[in-house]
Interface confidence: low
């Protein structure tokens, strides 16, 4: 307790380590001969409180006992959690310019004593691993804290390993370095952990286990998958394992999958057949495995092993959708577009597709393979023609799928009635109809088409396509449906060898268009002004146009312009108006209408019509 | 009490190389968790790496802002109370001022993120790299 310096002595009491709450009585002495020079009596002890190095408190209050000149007690309460430094200096009061000159100091501990070690739990990996414990110490106690792991067991076996805790590391993990063997299965071992540090000591409860309990074995290794006759759903899973394991546990998931499939094997010995594999699809084995049926703890998972299933020949129908253009009186160009097959169906790398056009009779057959999802050809236009596609990858090819060749939209009977296009949200239409009222044939399906109406964009993008069935009258259209862009909608209700169709525009979002139309001329025919003009830009249409409209007004005229409303049609440029006065000078400019509002009016024109008024 | 002087910061071409020092005085500190930070003009400061006084137990444990994984590396040497920043495969990106910062835990195997959990700073070194 006693720290000798050269000027004097701090002692401390009861101890320099204290429990939290307690308080400290320091003493600070001179050494015989040490002091002021000439003037004992004005000897004066300070003692100063340091925590991390920074002053906090010059007790000068809290003595409690002084021999002048010589020694003086102080007392010390209300001490903080870990280490406090304190500073007794002594101060020779007859000189004022002299600093206080150091004595000695001692260093206070607070803390707590260790509370019991608890959640004992103990494992060794692998039949070759060696035990080791970890368990929770409780409460920080801010003292250097050793803590012992014992360990007993059969035939007078005992094994201890010790560890300390303090402001810098933390034990609550040893490693006995001994190995249980299997031949120790049925024996129980006990361990309990003791802390002990400067305030008191405690226990833990004793802690009772067997080889099972503890012993996880190590995760498989070296898996591999071997496929039978190179399936693509079958596939024999082998690994290595420890000697003891007797219970495995599989998991395998496609790569993309968020659920695994489990599957448990009893003395698989390393090997396990697989049936339900998807082919050709991306998945991750993963093995796990316990000692003892019942009893024991399951292994980590083992390293996952990647791989991908091969291929086997396609399954599945392909989407057909074709495109008839006359070229002249007898032929006409067919474009056939069809939809890739998901990945559960192409089963593989489609690698070409093979195409037939067949005259009904056989009399001509055109043939063709191709890596493109679309194909045209120029034929007659006489005959009935039917086609056909599939899909083929290395294993083989899909079923053919078929289509006959008619006038889409050659049976008025056959259109569907009532078409209406309502945007749902940003990024989808809800298109609904009514069944064509006199179809002298039944309707095997519909097929709902759309394309942007954008310049060009009958030649430069296939369409997008949806088949329904005959009895539903809706369809939700999503795919490459972007909010502002207005769309072409035909309905098209197909029989064995007729078709119908309606159209109708839509977009899933609108606002007013950015600008109105450019009027380019204006002409004065019979008595009748033609308005000529050039569409809205298509960036700036921002959804379907449904009218565009025509202002004019007296050139100087404070009156209202008045107005003629158009419904819009893509092919029209030019609107006869006929009720303007002769010899009078007017001001005329269109605006264009979608569903959100009118556009800003476009350019002014000014005219002065030269005929007679009607 | 640590206190906290950083050092090594200047200009360098994009790819280039730099290895900041920070150096802490108090003899406790070798039981601060101890991080990295950085503020580009205009921006709010952020993590860019840190390391623990982990004790011999478990060894030292660093964390890394995700944008300097694998080119930045935090170390320390605690018996010449240093800490250092070795930041490879410079961007232009990690243009600021470098900060060193330490906290004290009672639990010290912990690295955290945010500023408000350092207690102690460093004044700073200006990071410039140039494309």
């Known amino acids: 307790n006693i720290d000798v310096c050269k000027l004097g002595t701090v002692t401390v009491q009861p101890a320099p380590v204290i429990p939290l709450g307690s308080a400290a009585n320091i003493s600070c002495s001179l050494n015989p001969k040490q002091g002021c020079s000439h003037y004992p009596s004005s000897n004066e002890l300070i003692l100063l409180k340091f925590v991390n190095d920074v002053l906090v408190e010059n007790l000068h209050g809290k003595k409690v006992h002084d021999h002048t000149g010589h020694s003086s007690t102080f007392q010390v309460t209300n001490l903080s959690l870990g280490m406090t430094l304190f500073v007794c200096k002594l101060n020779c009061s007859n000189s004022q310019k002299k600093p206080p000159v150091p004595v000695c100091g001692v260093e206070i501990s607070v803390g707590v004593a260790p509370e019991p070690p608890q959640n004992i739990s103990c494992v060794q990996e692998g039949e070759n691993g060696t035990v080791a414990c970890s368990w929770n110490s409780g409460k920080v106690t801010y003292l250097k804290t050793n803590y012992t792991l014992q360990l007993s067991g059969p035939n007078n076996l005992t094994c201890q390993k010790q560890c300390f805790s303090d402001n810098r590391q933390n034990c609550n993990r040893l490693d006995l370095g001994i190995n249980l063997s299997p031949d120790l299965a049925e024996s129980r071992f006990i361990v309990r952990v003791t802390a002990i540090n400067d305030l008191g000591n405690s226990s833990s409860l004793p802690h009772t286990f067997t080889f099972l309990d503890i012993v996880i074995p190590l995760p498989p290794w070296d898996i591999r998958i071997n496929f039978l006759n190179a399936s693509g759903s079958r596939g024999t899973l082998q690994w290595e394992d420890e000697g003891q394991v007797v219970l495995n546990q599989l998991r395998y998931q496609p790569l993309n999958s968020t659920s695994w499939n489990m599957v448990n094997a009893t003395n698989a010995k390393g090997k396990y057949d697989l049936r339900d594999l998807r082919p050709f699809t991306e998945y991750e084995f993963q093995i796990s495995s316990k000692l003892h049926l019942s009893g024991g703890s399951w292994s980590n998972w083992s390293e996952s092993l990647r791989t991908r299933t091969p291929e086997e020949e396609p399954v599945g129908i392909l989407d057909i959708w074709y495109m008839k253009q006359d070229i002249d009186y007898d032929r006409q160009q067919i474009s056939l577009f069809w939809k890739s097959l998901n990945p559960s169906e192409a089963r593989g790398k489609i690698l070409h597709y093979q195409v037939t056009l067949q005259e009904v009779t056989k009399k001509t057959t055109l043939q063709n393979t191709t890596r493109h999802t679309s194909w045209t050809r120029v034929i007659p236009r006489t005959g009935a023609w039917t086609a056909s596609v599939s899909a083929a990858n290395s294993k083989g090819a899909s079923a053919p799928t078929h289509i006959n060749i008619v006038d889409l939209c050659g049976t008025g009977l056959l259109a569907p009635h009532q078409v209406s296009a309502k945007s749902e949200n940003m990024d989808n239409i809800l298109v609904t109809w009514q069944p064509p009222k006199k179809a002298d044939s039944a309707v095997r399906e519909y097929i709902v088409e759309w394309r942007a109406l954008q310049p060009g964009s009958i030649t430069k993008f296939p369409p997008h396509w949806l088949r329904i069935p005959p009895d539903n009258m809706s369809a939700l259209i999503s795919e490459n449906i972007k909010p502002y862009i207005c769309y072409e909608i035909r309905v098209h209700a197909l029989s064995e060898s007729q078709g119908g169709c309606s159209s109708i525009r839509g977009d899933s979002k609108h606002k007013a268009p950015v600008s109105g139309p450019h009027i380019t001329a204006i002409t004065e025919k019979k008595e009748r002004l033609f308005i000529s003009w050039t569409h809205i830009p298509f960036p700036e249409q921002r959804g379907c146009i449904l009218h565009y409209r025509i202002y004019w007004k007296e050139r100087d005229s404070t009156a209202q312009p008045e107005l003629c409303e158009i419904q819009y049609r893509r092919s029209q440029n030019s609107h006869p108006i006929s009720s303007l006065q002769p010899r009078v000078t007017y001001v005329l400019w269109m605006t264009a209408v979608t569903a959100a509002g009118e556009s800003p009016q476009g350019n002014e024109r000014e005219f002065c019509p030269q005929g007679k008024a009607n | 009490q640590v206190q906290l002087q950083e050092s090594g910061g200047g200009l360098v071409q994009a790819g280039g190389s730099l290895t900041l020092s920070c150096t802490a005085s108090?003899?406790?500190?070798?039981?601060?968790?101890t991080g990295w930070f950085r503020q580009a003009p205009g921006k709010e400061r952020e993590f860019v790496a840190g390391?623990?006084?982990?004790?011999?137990?478990?060894?030292?444990?660093?964390s890394y802002a995700d944008s300097v994984k694998g080119r930045f590396t935090i170390s320390r040497d605690n018996a010449k109370n240093m800490i250092y920043l070795q930041m490879n495969s410079l961007k232009p990106d990690d243009t600021g001022v470098y900060y060193c910062?330490?906290?004290?835990?009672?639990?010290?195997?912990?690295?955290?993120?945010?500023?408000?959990?350092?207690?102690?700073w460093g004044q700073g070194t200006q990071v410039t790299v140039s494309s």
């Open positions: 910062a330490a906290a004290s835990y009672g639990t010290r195997y912990y690295v955290g993120s945010t500023a408000n959990e350092y207690t102690t």
């Open positions: 108090g003899r406790t500190f070798s039981s601060y968790t």
């Open positions: 390391i623990s006084s982990g004790g011999s137990w478990i060894g030292d444990i660093t």
